[in-house]
Amino acid sequence: MAPWPELGDAQPNPDKYLEGAAGQQPTAPDKSKETNKTDNTEAPVTKIELLPSYSTATLIDEPTEVDDPWNLPTLQDSGIKWSERDTKGKILCFFQGIGRLILLLGFLYFFVCSLDILSSAFQLVGGKMAGQFFSNSSIMSNPLLGLVIGVLVTVLVQSSSTSTSIVVSMVSSSLLTVRAAIPIIMGANIGTSITNTIVALMQVGDRSEFRRAFAGATVHDFFNWLSVLVLLPVEVATHYLEIITQLIVESFHFKNGEDAPDLLKVITKPFTKLIVQLDKKVISQIAMNDEKAKNKSLVKIWCKTFTNKTQINVTVPSTANCTSPSLCWTDGIQNWTMKNVTYKENIAKCQHIFVNFHLPDLAVGTILLILSLLVLCGCLIMIVKILGSVLKGQVATVIKKTINTDFPFPFAWLTGYLAILVGAGMTFIVQSSSVFTSALTPLIGIGVITIERAYPLTLGSNIGTTTTAILAALASPGNALRSSLQIALCHFFFNISGILLWYPIPFTRLPIRMAKGLGNISAKYRWFAVFYLIIFFFLIPLTVFGLSLAGWRVLVGVGVPVVFIIILVLCLRLLQSRCPRVLPKKLQNWNFLPLWMRSLKPWDAVVSKFTGCFQMRCCCCCRVCCRACCLLCDCPKCCRCSKCCEDLEEAQEGQDVPVKAPETFDNITISREAQGEVPASDSKTECTAL
């Protein structure tokens, strides 16, 4: 893959801009500078100046003021003012507001429920495989393997609490040491951030909305990945998390506490348990190498059971295997002993849709995965639509000001920390960081919350989920209390360490810059969002997993060159932007590389070819399909409901649209049009919410 998505001639001057680059770029443009931009070394070089901070539009004329795509959109209120309404209008307006609020809460409820069912679906599809990841003995010696197992398992079961509880039970039963568990917890932290990234994909319809939503979601990913990148080697070298948490656990004489309060689950469980109920113990049993569990179904059939303890006679290889010498005898052929067995008597079946279908877990999981994604997408569209109609004019201004404005000087720096606390508190209330960050994603998309404000909220969410884990640990039975508490504290201190690394100093807020960079790339090449998801959450972890299984030598043999190349590219990139003069002429830009290695354009062409079949029949039978359609084929006209793409060739012929001055754009999402992907007249036919 390219070192940077779009690398034209690297500028000798570090203050100039690169289109689509995810590198460090000043936020305020220097209009006196110019930059060369080419996609091909042979192509004539056009002197252009790029828009401020990541804009993908190329402009020839001296620009008048152009909006930064990261600026929040102004939500115009086209309705009649309150004061101008008559009594009947006011009453109607009031009830409309109440109706909207009820609808909003309703869709929000089903949105959260669909997230829960999505998690169940993932567990049904990949839960057993996830459990088997844990039974790999190399975890003990290889922290990198532990990390990727944490990522993969959490991605597969869509729940960090499930993977964490498996780790806790494995530590409690001495199958895993706390030292070996820490990388898995770090991986679980990464894995849990996939949920809101999936939610962000649902907002693919509107480019500007998608840019913000995807960046807002991936800021969580980047925070977690960067934290691990720094803290995993530190932990391996110093074991500071293990030591600190051990000291805390040993210094307190904990008594078993109460269970963490299930505040949101109380509301959602009555509905979700009618859809499906899972026996989560099965995944844990598989992780603990229980052979019988491999054939068990995750779908819970019996909800009311009676457990009867009884003693049975069992044969043993020798008297040494007897439960005790007093419970040991021979029948002349075999040695026998008495074992306590728990006999489970099924009394009442569970009340959910799949209870009598007896379908395999994969089938149930697939059905639920599709349905939950459809509901998730539908609810998200409706939430965005309702919020869009509510948050207009004055209301939007007030909300945006309240959420995004800092405290007055000299307390401005405190705002972010308050946001961290709010994020932690909200996550504690909803008992899930996935739910909180997923609910945040559409708000970032529609422009209610800035990424700069979403970032501390997300960090707070990371803390909130660990406090829930600490409470849950305190409620553990005696034998599991110490291990579960230590693991929960490791999780807590890992997130605290991450915040200390990537938040207090504005300069270190790298996740924001990286997320914005990715947001820009994904807004231009929407397929890249899916590509990013697959690469970071599946391919990289699976590759590391595979290499780890092959042994340390193979892992180091492949890993060291890869890491070396990445570091080399980063150093070169840094030198190109900061002090290019120290580099030889050839290395001052990326033109020495073939186009496919420095630009996403050729890859875009390949993806377009593959999705050509979708482009030609890009029908939108439903508004939900529209999202998938836009994501797959980047079709400009596909989202007029029940209409298909008309004359795509026309859109493709218009590839070389002349570059315009900013005043000719009638949409702030100018990047696509500026790149000549769609005629100007169609700039508003992007996938609208409804």
Epitope: N313, S326, T330, G332
Partner: antibody, heavy 119, light 107 residues
Framework: QVQLVQSGAEVKKPGASVKMSCKAS????????VHWVRQAPGQGLEWIAA????????SYAQKFQGRATLTVDRSTSTAYMELSSLRSEDTAVYYC????????????WGQGTLVTVSS | DVQMTQSPSSLSASVGDRVTITCRAS??????LNWYQQKPGKAVKLLIY???RLQSGVPSRFSGSGSGTDYTLTISSLQPEDIATYYC?????????FGQGTKLEIK
């Protein structure tokens, strides 16, 4: 009713082999173990070996390992014991008995087969 | 192997007497002990299993007790038909071992 009918008395020379039978009736042959116990004249009982007709599992007392061979014929519900390399001290009454799997007792015994070893 | 020692090796008692036969194991057999009765010219019969449990069809005058290494068979009221040789057998440790027997006679 449960019956274990053993073959008749045998007189053997030292070094020879003897094969005795035990025909079972009145119960499911494969559900029980068949034990062989001997009693030398004026002596106590001595356990020799056992076999499970159901799965063919065998077990021998160390003393008889290699000399005693237990077999079963499920079609006729008959158990056999062959004792080789006979010595004069092998002169005894050989009993077959029925024992329930998992139980350390024999509840029904055969009438015994007298084996006399003399030159 | 576990050695089983019965005492006395023979005893005489009158009809109606309470008779006690003891059996000592060379090591703890954890109550895994049976008692058998062998009448002259008849098949051996199981009387008591697992120290104290009466086999079906056995008169209630027979009882067993004991633990560890010491066990007893008691006939509460001796009857003429009880004339026989009595054997104890342990089944805690492989192989099964029997006591040398106690011969009971009527005075």
């Amino acid at each position: 009713q449960v019956q274990l009918v053993q073959s008749g008395a045998e007189v053997k020379k030292p070094g020879a082999s003897v094969k005795m039978s035990c025909k079972a009736s009145g119960f499911t042959f494969t559900s029980y173990n068949v034990h062989w116990v001997r009693q030398a004249p004026g002596q106590g009982l001595e356990w020799i070996a056992a076999i499970s007709p159901g799965n063919g599992d065998l077990s021998y007392a160390q003393k008889f390992q290699g000399r005693a061979t237990l077999t079963v014929d499920r079609s006729t519900s008959t158990a056999y014991m062959e004792l080789s390399s006979l010595r004069s001290e092998d002169t005894a009454v050989y009993y077959c008995a029925r024992g329930r799997t998992g139980m350390g007792a024999v509840d029904y015994w055969g009438q015994g087969t007298l084996v006399t070893v003399s030159s | 192997d576990v050695q089983m020692t019965q005492s006395p090796s023979s005893l005489s008692a009158s009809v109606g007497d309470r008779v006690t036969i003891t059996c000592r194991a060379s090591q703890d057999v954890y109550s895994y002990l049976n008692w058998y009765q062998q009448k002259p010219g008849k098949a051996v019969k199981l009387l008591i299993y697992y120290t104290s449990r009466l086999q079906s069809g056995v008169p209630s005058r027979f009882s067993g007790s004991g633990s560890g290494t010491d066990y007893t068979l008691t006939i509460s009221s001796l009857q003429p038909e009880d004339i026989a040789t009595y054997y104890c057998q342990q089944y805690n440790i492989f192989p099964w071992t029997f006591g040398q027997g106690t011969k009971l006679e009527i005075k």
